[in-house]
């Protein structure tokens, strides 16, 4: 006879029908309390209505309780990231209960079938939480559900079905297919917990987006724009992660959300900051490095609860591996030009010199195009903490080697063969550190020498306090 399981009746693996020789059909969701940091330890299995394992395995009723929820699986085994996450949680929160939700039999199916099983698994987790709430000292506010991919939506269902409100849900690159644009009750949403934070690492506006693009939490963080993750290119995975195929690139980018979260647990001294911004392009332009009015936040475990925000999109750059932290800088550069330089865009690099270290030659990424006789904003980032910025060097490498630019160069030459070499005038650069929120203005050492041409460099030093331009005839007055 069928074993009842939650509101949906018996769970049956649609791909693998249980054999007749099996004496019983087990529910396909179980809860493994990880009692040791040792990944080889089998842990303890908890089940609703059985209090003995809670006592035997020293479940701490007053401590934080983490539920880790895996996603769809092609192999039917726990993936390697899971053990890293368990270990990191144990390292950071020594007294916490870490529970792995094992729904492998229901996840090891066609993706569409696994999606259809998410609701039932969410119910199962909610039942477990409802039962734990009957125990003295257990608080739903101490519960943190961490769901990866399809598991993020399972967490959403669990938060929706539980009696009360769970403290926090973290969605690690929530699954996109069949959830993008879905109704609020059929996917992870801010209503599912007191605080819902989300990391999006594999979103694509073209082709299949493995991760969900839309914001689904109180805060939605898009590292590196939420799409191409450093260290996950085909060239990178060829050399390091298994075999360099598109599948591995997808896995690398999708799983990056987990590693960013693990990083936030184990590298407390190197917290990554994200900055609120309306879209990725504006962030790439360097416009969004403000921390005013809660516009910046830590990412991952250290994210500060922001319940007043909803679907707040936040961005940051990261390194290719742990620790992922980088240091963001906004550069405001006023560029003046005497002559019309056509549509060609200068290829500019900046090197930052600090009290602790010097940066590499950093490209000033032109997101749209440089506006002449206007202030342009750029985003640059460094992997090292440079300390206090002391000086900087701007280099013009000449035109970018695109056919479009080469054609424009040729066209400009034909129309103005006597045109002097192209020249930009940059008198000062205003720098703001995203991490410290400090602003510093850098000036050219000699105000009369502020021009730069292809193949040249221009040095900037901290402007002296109260420094004013004395030469009133200069074309730069009131421009910067």
């Amino acid at each position: 006879s069928p074993v009842p399981f939650g509101p949906e009746g018996r769970l049956e693996d649609k791909l693998h029908k249980p054999k007749a020789t099996q004496t019983e059909v087990k529910p396909s969701v179980r809860f493994n309390l990880r009692t040791s940091k040792d990944p080889e330890h089998e842990g303890c299995y908890l089940s609703v209505g059985h209090s003995q394992p809670l006592e035997d395995c020293s479940f701490n009723m007053t401590a934080k309780t983490f539920f880790i929820i895996h996603g769809w699986t092609m192999s039917g085994i726990f993936e390697n990231w899971l053990h890293k996450l368990v270990s990191a949680l144990h390292t950071r929160e020594k007294d916490a209960n870490v529970v792995v939700v094992d729904w492998l039999p229901l996840a090891h199916q066609l993706y569409t079938d696994a999606v259809n099983n998410t609701r039932v698994v969410g119910h199962s987790i909610a039942r477990m939480l409802d039962w734990l709430q009957e125990k003295d000292d257990f608080s739903l506010g101490n519960v943190h559900l961490i769901g990866y991919s399809l598991g993020a939506h399972v967490a959403g269902y669990a938060g929706n079905f539980v009696k009360g409100t769970v403290g926090r849900i973290t969605g690690l690159d929530p699954a996109g297919p069949m959830f993008e644009g879905a109704d609020i009750h059929k996917r992870l949403s801010p209503d599912d917990a007191d605080f819902v934070d989300v990391l999006h690492t594999y979103t694509r506006s073209f082709g299949l987006s493995i991760g969900i693009q839309m914001p689904v939490g109180h805060i939605d963080i898009y590292p590196n724009g939420g799409d191409f993750q450093p260290g996950c290119g085909l060239n990178d995975v060829l050399g390091s992660i298994a075999y360099g195929t598109i599948t591995e690139v997808v896995k690398c980018e999708h799983e990056r959300a987990v590693h960013l979260f693990v990083d936030s647990l184990v590298n407390q001294d190197k917290p990554s900051f994200a900055f609120q911004c309306t879209d990725s392009n504006r962030f790439k332009k360097g416009i969004c490095l403000s921390c005013r009015k809660n516009r910046c936040n830590n990412i991952g475990y250290n994210a500060k609860k922001m319940r007043k925000k909803r679907n707040s999109k936040m961005y940051l750059k990261t390194r290719a591996g742990m620790p992922f932290k980088v240091y963001h800088y906004q550069l405001k550069v006023h560029m003046f030009s005497y002559n019309n330089s056509g549509d060609t865009q200068p290829t500019l690099y900046i090197t930052l010199y600090g009290s602790n270290a010097d940066s590499q030659n950093l490209p000033l990424e032109i997101v749209e195009k440089i506006e002449l006789n206007a202030t342009n904003t750029f985003l640059v980032y460094t992997e090292e903490d440079l300390g206090d910025l002391l000086k900087m060097r701007l280099t013009w490498e000449g035109v970018a080697h695109s056919w479009y630019n080469l054609w424009n160069e040729f066209r400009n030459y034909l129309s103005q063969p006597s045109n002097p070499s192209r020249e930009l005038y940059i008198r000062r650069i205003r720098v703001k550190s995203g991490e410290t929120q400090r602003k510093v203005t850098f000036c050219t050492q000699d105000p009369t020498k502020s021009s730069i041409s292809p193949g040249q460099e221009l040095w900037f030093h901290k402007c002296q306090d109260g420094w004013k331009m004395k030469n009133k005839t200069s074309p730069f007055v009131n421009l910067a």
Partner: antibody
């Protein structure tokens, strides 16, 4: 102590079927997956697949799909491997070996092996 | 699937000598700082026995003369001073992804 006890040697004719058992003791049967490994005479080790001892879901390696069936009887902590339509090339020693669901999934406990001989 | 290649196929060593066995994977079997590489010993007529797990960890009850090293795609099993009971076939195995695959084995025989 932890051990896996396998059924005795079998001699079968081509086209027949064989069912090898593997009885576990000394640990909680459903807390570890059960693997099946084949070793043909004078050859190396070949992973055939495994069964999730909690859910009963089997996974078969590429070359072992079709004629091979993994089943369980959790009441007796026993795993079974059944092979139908036997051929001479199925002559081998068949091992069961447990692996954890967590960690690095190595095979830490092995049965002594069951020799299956297919001969006309 | 990941292909494991062991060398040499046969190693002739005198008792008391050091034996070094090599195993190469067709792709990395590392995940972060962990290596999903294991070594087994098999004597004639017996089942394999786990010797080393995760590249360098000694399994329960295994003598300290056995040691494992390596990362990425290249791994080594070392027997510091061969005893008579160590003459056997040694297999390496990866479990970073399914299917778990074994190397072809290295037979350590008496010289």
């Amino acid at each position: 102590q932890v051990q896996l006890v396998q059924s005795g040697a079998e001699v079968k004719k081509p086209g027949a079927s064989v069912k090898v058992s593997c009885k576990a003791s000394g640990y909680t049967f459903t807390n570890y997956g059960m693997n099946w490994v084949r070793q043909a005479p004078g050859q190396g080790l070949e992973w055939m697949g495994w069964i999730n001892t909690y859910s009963g879901v089997p996974t078969y390696a590429g070359d072992f799909k079709g004629r091979f069936t993994f089943t369980l009887d959790t009441s007796t902590s026993t795993a079974y491997m059944e092979l139908s339509s036997l051929r001479s090339e199925d002559t081998a020693v068949y091992y069961c070996a447990r692996r954890g669901y967590y960690g690095r999934r190595y095979f830490d406990v092995w049965g002594k092996g069951t020799t299956v001989t297919v001969s006309s | 699937e990941i292909v494991m290649t062991q060398s040499p196929a046969t190693l002739s060593v005198s008792p008391g000598e050091r034996a070094t066995l090599s195993c190469k994977a067709s792709q990395s079997v590392d995940y972060d700082v962990d290596s999903y590489m294991h070594w087994y010993q098999q004597k004639p007529g017996q089942a394999p026995r786990l010797l080393i797990y995760a590249a360098s960890n000694l399994a329960s009850g295994i003598p300290a003369r056995f040691s494992g090293s390596g990362s990425g795609t290249e791994f080594t099993l070392t027997i510091s001073s061969l005893q008579s009971e160590d003459f056997a076939v040694y297999y390496c195995q990866q479990t970073i992804e399914d299917p778990p695959t074994f190397g072809g084995g290295t037979k350590v025989e008496i010289k």
